[in-house]
């Protein structure tokens, strides 16, 4: 168990734990104090004791010992009184820290006393050697517990220069692969530096005497170190490995290192000392094996094999850990170690080896673990696990602390939990105690909640309630108990309505550049704070201040100016503080394809066959399959910026061989097309020019026509530049009279025409036009028939007669003309006709002529749209390409027809039952007028009760209708007549009902002079005449509101003038009809000094 921080008020004891200790190896130098450190924590306070070499050691009883009097320390210092005192205290120390819960133990501390270093007295004889031979100058420094540094110097304290020939070994000896006379010195001194004592001692100087020789003999390498052919080494895992090979020979050998058993780990290997030393950092298992050094010179080689075995000091696989336990639990301490050789593991309890403990202990040791079952407070202890092999020792202290603690609920009482229907609520009840308390949940009735399978408990005391329902709202009680006590808390649960998206966004496919609207509707619990947000591909979307890309409002997301990058998943997130629901829709943005990214030409050798291969990378399809690729070309020389399609290939194709034309400067581009249209074109290809060739086509539309009587102009449609097949093209024109079989005349021209002069009128010619360029001629051209120039026709069409079809149409017929007199191709006939006037009277107006063109194969025409009862003049002419020939003339008349409609029919109301009709005669009589027909019927009777009158006087302009119903509206129809019958009608609707009602003065106004006023109005069309009174009433105090006598006025008269008014006076004008007040207006007369005349043309009554 672990005591939670919130579990307060219980002062738990602590077993001893070593917090600081001296290193495992302690070297003491003559002038140093000895400090042995051992510190530990624990409650109650810790007591310390020491052993030396396994025997109880009491620091306080030793001379010169200072013990630190601090509660957590068992450390002590020994101060010496002579240089040799430390020897007395050498040994293996161990510290034990104890309190009532157990004993912790330090590791073994090996104390070693190092004396002052001295070189043993020796007489160093001179070393004599012949030039070229090898030599070893020994150093043999005194032994030292700490690593020391060796330097070779001369008496001037100058380092002996080392190189491939002269090397100091790891052992301190100075090796010469071969000596030179320059090595002859008497002061080779080996210096040993002891960092611990901060002292340097030196050996007696060595005198090296080199005898010169005239002939140095070459010799193959021999190893000076190691001397044998192989050696075995143990390397420690994690430590560096140093291998050394020093060779002699002449010339000086070079050293190489090999690893026959595998690759040399280049990242961890360094070569030092001119390759004589191999250092391998951080040795691992994989470094086990053979390493070989090879010394070589021009005479041969020597070798040494190092067989390296990698071993390891003990190291942890699983270190035992201290733990608290409650009564009844099982304690298990794992102690798993590894090393090479495999370490031996021993257990101690409170510092005592388990072998020395009584046999009735309840622990058992099983596969490297110490196990205690059903622990009780009396089983509290500190255990030690120790592992050792020949390379070292590993120690771990771990306690088993069995505590008894009362049950306590660490979750606050009376907490309120809120969750939504259908979700899972978690009611917390974190309890702690030792033994671990049991936890149970009860409802308000004190009944366990676990009868409902929706309620499920967790080991940590939490109660889960899944598929929440509204009636789960209420109070719940958590009860925690162990063998010491029991405690309870209450939890309140409120179940809210779950948030629901009632209408989520819908997946859609939209076009690039358009906008899309996603909508989202959700329902929320009314007591919760609702929120609707939008996400795009998992990112929160917001309206950006400086951009109108997104518009978010009222559950709507509008994305403007859609681009392909907007494609993705959009979701509406409806949330409250309790729940979140999300509804997702997919947006696909479609549009025309992207550009073809890359275009390559290949097989350029095919250009000689007017072909080339074009390949391209596929374009982005933008969610609509590419249907086809359009391959276009441009010729920058002949038509820059103009692109021509060479063809389309299916959308699954990305290359094609193109058929080209000779001598075109082709630059290609490719455009992808899908159902939305073409995309951007690819980058343009390189320009390639096809070799020249003779033309493959001749001009088309070859014609021969004269533009004068004595010539023939041969024309043709020039070849398009892409058919020239060369830089220029010319035309070989050939001609000869048709049917002569004589020689062809020919001319080569650059223009698309040729004029042949001095021809007879209208002679047929055979014509050929052939394309020609620098490479040759086009194919054999086809023969076309052309004609020399035409003359005006001399043929006069002979009229056969005119047939009157009706009053406005005639059929004209003539005989075909003699073609010989046409002097060209008969193109047709021109028929011209015009009206000379009515048969009633001849007009002197401007004559308008009409024309009809009749094809050459037709000899009749119908002239329609003529005016009845009129005289016409007619001309017919044959015409060819040159013009029209002489005309044949004729006159004819059209018979009478029915007249046009009468003009301007007016209805004037005479009384409630009578109307006066006024009209004007028709503009087109189309014959002799014989009178009028008047018809009328009430409107609401659907045409029944039609009455008709024949008015037989053609000069009649009015007609009075009586006995009309004042309550009906009528439809009036008036037609003029000739002997051919009645013509078109003029129609009006009206009656006395609408017109005789309340008088309407329409647009009434009043103007004034100095002593008069004119009242005027516009009588309404058809309004029945009536009489009314006009009364002028002066305003103002001095006038006393005097009125003039009322005047009787007729509606039809349109105006009325009132005389005898006062100058500069305001008047009110009142209009009465049958004593009913109908209208009121105001007017003011002018001041004096003006002419008193009413405006001209005003009637007075």
């Amino acid at each position: 168990i672990q005591i939670p921080e919130e579990y307060e008020g219980h002062h738990v004891m602590e077993p001893p734990v070593i917090t600081e200790q001296s290193p495992r190896r302690l070297v003491v130098f003559p002038t140093d104090d000895i400090s042995l450190k051992c510190e530990a924590s624990g409650k109650p306070e810790v007591q310390f004791r020491w052993t030396r070499d396994g025997v109880h050691f009491k620091p306080k009883e030793e001379l010169g010992v200072t013990v630190y009097q601090s509660p957590h320390s068992g450390s002590f210092t020994i101060t010496g009184n002579n240089s040799n005192f430390a020897q007395r205290f050498q040994g293996i120390y161990r510290c034990f820290a104890s309190n009532k819960l157990g004993t912790a133990m330090s590791h073994e501390i090996r104390l070693m006393a190092e004396g002052a270093p001295k070189w043993p007295k020796e007489t160093v004889k001179p070393v004599e050697v012949e030039e070229g031979e090898s030599v070893v100058l020994p150093c043999n420094p005194p032994p030292s517990a700490e690593p020391l540094r060796i330097y070779w110097m001369n008496s001037k304290i100058l380092h002996i220069k080392q190189d491939e020939r002269v090397t100091m070994g790891q052992n301190g000896n100075l090796y010469f692969a071969n000596v030179l006379t320059s090595d002859n010195h008497s002061d080779y001194i080996c210096h040993a530096h002891f960092p611990g004592t901060r002292t340097i001692i030196q050996k007696e100087p060595i005198d090296l005497r080199v005898k010169a020789t005239n002939s140095m003999i070459d010799r193959k390498p021999r190893l000076l170190f190691p001397t044998n052919s192989s050696s075995h080494l143990v390397a420690l895992q994690g430590q560096p490995l140093v291998l050394e090979c020093i060779a002699e020979g002449f010339p000086t050998p070079t050293i190489k290192w090999l690893r026959p058993s595998g690759p040399m780990p280049a990242d961890r290997v360094t070569y030092q000392n001119h390759n004589k030393t191999l250092q391998l950092l951080k040795v691992g298992e994989e470094d086990d094996g053979e390493y070989r050094c090879l010394a070589e010179n021009s005479l041969g080689s020597a070798r040494h094999a190092y067989y390296v075995t990698v071993e390891a000091a003990p190291y942890w696989l699983h270190k035992p850990q201290s733990h608290l336990y409650g009564p009844g639990e099982t304690a298990r301490l794992d102690c798993q170690v590894q090393g090479r050789p495999q370490p031996e593991v021993t257990w101690r309890i409170n510092g005592i080896p388990v072998e020395e403990l009584a046999k009735d202990q309840k622990y058992r040791i099983q596969r490297g673990a110490l196990i205690l079952s059903n622990v009780q407070p009396s089983d509290t202890m500190v255990t030690q696990c120790e592992a050792r092999n020949r390379h070292g020792l590993l120690l771990a202290n771990a306690y088993i602390y069995v505590v008894q603690l009362p049950a306590k609920i660490l979750t606050a009482d009376n907490q309120t939990y809120m969750a939504v229907q259908g979700s899972t609520a978690y009611l917390l009840c974190k309890a702690f105690g030792a033994p671990v308390p049991s936890v149970q949940w009860l409802d308000e009735d004190g009944t366990t909640v676990l009868q409902d399978e929706r309620f499920f408990p967790y080991a940590n005391g939490t109660l889960g309630i899944r598929d929440l329902q509204a009636n789960d709202t209420g109070r719940y009680f958590c009860l925690a108990a162990n063998d010491q006590n029991n405690v309870t808390i209450m939890a309140n649960l409120k179940v809210k309505d779950a948030t629901q998206i009632t209408q989520g966004p819908r997946s859609t496919i939209e076009k690039k550049g358009s906008r899309v609207t996603f909508t989202c509707q959700a329902s929320f619990d009314p007591s919760l704070q609702p929120s609707i947000t939008w996400r795009g591909d998992g990112r929160d979307l917001q309206e950006l201040g400086d951009s109108d890309k997104y518009f978010i409002e009222d559950g709507r997301l509008v994305i403007h100016s859609l681009d392909y990058s907007d494609q993705g998943n959009y979701s509406c997130v409806a949330s409250t503080e309790l729940d979140v629901v999300e509804s997702r829709a997919q947006l696909l943005v479609v549009g025309s394809p992207g550009p073809v990214p890359r275009l390559v030409l290949s097989d350029l050798h095919l250009l000689t066959q007017s072909q080339v291969r074009v390949s391209w990378s596929p374009a982005e399809d933008h969610n609509a399959p590419i249907e086809k690729y359009d391959i276009e070309f441009e010729d920058k020389e002949m038509a820059p910026e103009k692109w021509y399609s060479l063809g389309k290939v299916p959308g699954n194709q990305t290359s094609t061989t193109l058929k080209l034309s000779p001598y075109v400067h082709y630059t290609f581009r490719v455009t992808a097309i899908n159902k939305y249209g073409p995309g951007e074109p690819s980058p343009v290809s390189e320009t390639v020019v096809t070799p020249e060739a003779a033309p493959e086509k001749n001009p088309v539309d070859v014609k021969g026509e004269g533009n004068e009587t004595t010539n023939m102009v041969i024309t043709w449609k020039p070849l398009r530049w892409m058919d020239w097949n060369a830089p220029q093209v010319q035309y070989r024109v050939q001609w000869r009279p048709q049917g002569t079989r004589g020689p062809w005349q020919e001319q080569i021209v650059s223009d698309p025409f040729l004029v042949v002069s001095n021809t007879s009128t209208f002679v047929p010619y055979e014509i050929k036009v052939q394309a020609v360029n620098s490479q040759g001629k086009g194919p054999e051209p086809q023969v076309t028939i052309g004609y020399s120039g035409e003359d005006y026709p001399q043929a006069i069409p002979e009229l056969e007669g005119i047939e009157i079809l009706n009053s406005s149409a005639v059929l004209v017929k003539w005989r075909p003309v003699d073609l010989a007199q046409v002097k060209g191709h008969l193109r047709g006939y021109n028929v011209t006709y015009w009206r000379e006037g009515s048969q009633r009277k001849h007009s002197k107006r401007h004559i308008h002529k009409d024309h009809v063109v009749v094809p050459a194969n037709t000899t009749s025409v119908i002239l329609s749209g003529l005016r009845p009862y009129s005289s016409y003049h007619l001309e017919v002419q044959a015409f060819n390409g040159r013009g029209s020939g002489p005309a044949s003339e004729f006159t004819f008349s059209t018979p009478e027809g029915v007249p046009g409609h009468p003009e301007a029919l007016h209805l004037e109301c005479q009384s409630n039952t009578s109307l006066l009709l006024r009209w004007q005669p028709p503009l087109s009589h189309n014959g002799v007028l014989t009178g009028y027909v008047l018809s009328y019927h009430p409107l609401d009777e659907g045409g029944k009760g039609q009455l008709s009158f024949n008015l037989r006087d053609p000069e009649l302009r009015t007609h009075n209708l009586t006995d009309l119903s004042p309550h009906l509206r009528y439809r009036f129809q008036l037609q003029a007549t000739t002997k051919e019958g009645p013509g078109e009608a003029i129609v009006r609707e009206g009656g006395t009902m609408a017109l005789s009602g309340i008088s309407d003065f329409g647009n009434i106004s009043a103007t004034a002079g100095e002593n008069y006023s004119v009242v005027s109005w516009v009588p309404k069309e058809g309004q029945c005449n009536f009489r009314f009174h006009i009364l002028f009433k002066a305003l103002g105090e001095e006038k006393g509101g005097a009125s003039l006598s009322p005047q009787y006025v007729s509606y039809n008269q349109s105006s009325y003038t009132q005389w005898d008014l006062q100058p500069d006076t305001d008047y009110e004008i009142h209009l009465f009809k049958e004593r009913m007040f109908r209208h009121q207006m105001a007017v003011k007369t002018n001041g004096t000094g003006r002419v008193r005349l009413p405006p001209a043309g005003f009637a007075t009554e």
């Epitope: 390559v600 050798h605 343009v684 390189e686």
Partner: antibody, heavy 119, light 107 residues
Framework: QVQLVQSGAEVKKPGSSVKVSCKAS????????IQWVRQAPGQGLEWIGY????????DYAQKFQGRVTLTADESTSTAYMELSSLRSEDTAVYYC????????????WGQGTTVTVSS | DIQMTQSPSSLSASVGDRVTITCRAS??????VAWYQQKPGKVPKLLIY???TLHSGVPSRFSGSGSGTDFTLTISSLQPEDVATYYC?????????FGGGTKVEIK
Amino acid sequence: QVQLVQSGAEVKKPGSSVKVSCKASGYTFTNYWIQWVRQAPGQGLEWIGYINPSTYYSDYAQKFQGRVTLTADESTSTAYMELSSLRSEDTAVYYCARRQFGLPLFDYWGQGTTVTVSS
Amino acid sequence: DIQMTQSPSSLSASVGDRVTITCRASQDVGTAVAWYQQKPGKVPKLLIYWASTLHSGVPSRFSGSGSGTDFTLTISSLQPEDVATYYCQQYSNYPLTFGGGTKVEIK
């Protein structure tokens, strides 16, 4: 008359980059593609790639893909070739050449720029 | 890539001699072959294209022939100013490739 003038010789360290310029005159720069070719000491000619100065579209030999960048500046009628991650075997004379109008041939050449790569 | 193999790699001939250089393509290139001349210390110069078409300004003693995979450059009468290295180039397909060159010297 048509001229292509290249920048001066360069000495570079392995791993670095070099940028060679080629200034064109005497013709409309954007009408003709610029090709780049190199010649190692005592060796033959090796095509590097081309650029279209009017659209800046370029393509390279597979061997140089990812290491070479061809650019052009229409305002100064200058083409550039940048070669990165230089190695000793990139030591060569680098030529720019105008592509003949109509075929991938080299009708006008720059005087060449010697690039030496050495540590 | 299309390999272009030139032979010989060098030759020595006397002034007035007829000199022939051959070039072999590793695949059919039709007649899409050009020849260049590079004088010592100078830039290459276009001589022939479409295997046999003389570039403007090139003396008529130079001629080319061949199609498919085998091509020949001929100098009908060697002149001192013809001392140079001659390269063939295929332009049928990218990458454009050159032959290794033929060095022509005067004896």
